[in-house]
């Protein structure tokens, strides 16, 4: 018996709360596919790689999506 | 105050079915996953299954995978677990949780009794 | 977890969990007291949610997480689990539970 359906996600439960950019090891968004339906936010934890999923429609991780991108386009040369 | 009201509990016989549901309030419920955890008679707890939040995906202890099958409602506001091929071994207090972050369920359903003998 | 744990009023009483690389892991522990549902008490090793008293404190190092109650008294007994999410397999993992008795 399979551990789940087919279908499978990451994200268990999700967070309209943005994370401390300075405690974040790493952001991913993860596309729709045919693993899973939906755009996922994952934000990896410095401390102890605990993963955070972030609610795609709430408009604090959109903020928080747009000012990470804009501190990599700094960085970037 | 957030609420998790449980109902669905009995006495069954060995091989037959059982719905259990948990109805939430007061929280955002399509946003969190939810867990059912069970309590045999003066027994730890044990971690039985969890449904994310949109449903897509599910997860199963051993002893149950394959009998019990988790499911929900985010119209409304519902959880399910329903238990088939029930088993002696089955009794127990069962609860319905809420996920929270890291290792953190806050929130925790009265329980209900079901009881599996012939 | 140790399946009990005496302690006289007013002493401290540590309740241990040991696993494989706790340390790695985030534990939460749950008291719970007959005939009721578990009660969350410490979360993220050592963070304590709103009405918990400041006597109940958690630590996590190595291959153990400890509960610390400080100031027991001779209310209900009470039993504590120590629980952690096992990302691999993603599912949950409770301890034994210690039942914690105030002489």
């Known amino acids: 018996v399979p551990l789940s359906r087919t279908v499978r996600c990451t994200c268990i439960s999700i967070s309209n709360q943005p994370v401390n950019p300075r405690s974040l090891e790493k952001l991913e968004i993860i596309p729709a596919s045919q693993f899973c339906p939906r755009v996922e936010i994952i934000a990896t934890m410095k401390k102890k790689g605990e993963k955070r999923c972030l609610n795609p429609e709430s408009k604090a991780i959109k903020n928080l999506l747009k000012a990470v991108s804009k501190e990599r386009s700094k960085r970037s040369p | 105050q957030v609420q998790l009201v449980q109902s669905g509990g009995g006495v069954v016989q060995p091989g037959r079915s059982l719905r259990l549901s948990c109805v939430a309030s007061?929280?955002?419920?399509?946003?969190?996953?939810m867990h059912w955890v069970r309590q045999a008679p003066g027994k730890g707890l044990e971690w039985v299954a969890l449904i994310s939040y949109d449903g897509s995906s599910e997860y199963y202890a051993d002893s149950v995978k394959g009998r019990f099958n988790i499911s929900r409602d985010n119209s409304k506001n519902t959880v399910y677990l329903q238990m088939n091929s029930l088993r002696a071994e089955d009794t127990a207090v069962y609860y319905c949780?809420?996920?929270?972050?890291?290792?953190?369920?806050?929130?925790w359903g009265q329980g209900t009794l079901v009881t599996v003998s012939s | 977890q140790a399946p009990s744990l005496s302690v006289s009023p007013g002493q401290t009483a540590n309740i241990i969990c040991s696993g494989d690389n706790l340390r790695t892991k985030y534990v939460s522990w749950y008291q719970q007291k007959p005939g009721q549902s578990p009660l969350l008490v410490i979360y993220q090793d050592t963070r304590r949610p709103s009405g918990i008293p400041a006597r109940f404190s958690g630590s996590n190092s190595g291959n153990t997480a400890t509960l610390t109650i400080s100031g027991t008294q001779t209310e209900r007994e009470s039993t504590y689990y120590c629980?952690?999410?096992?990302?691999?397999?993603?599912?949950?993992?409770f301890g034994g539970g210690t039942k914690l008795t105030v002489l």
């Open positions: 949780v809420k996920d929270g972050l890291a290792a953190k369920l806050g929130h």
């Open positions: 629980m952690t999410w096992d990302v691999d397999t993603t599912s949950m993992i």
């Open positions: 007061a929280f955002t419920f399509s946003r969190y996953g």
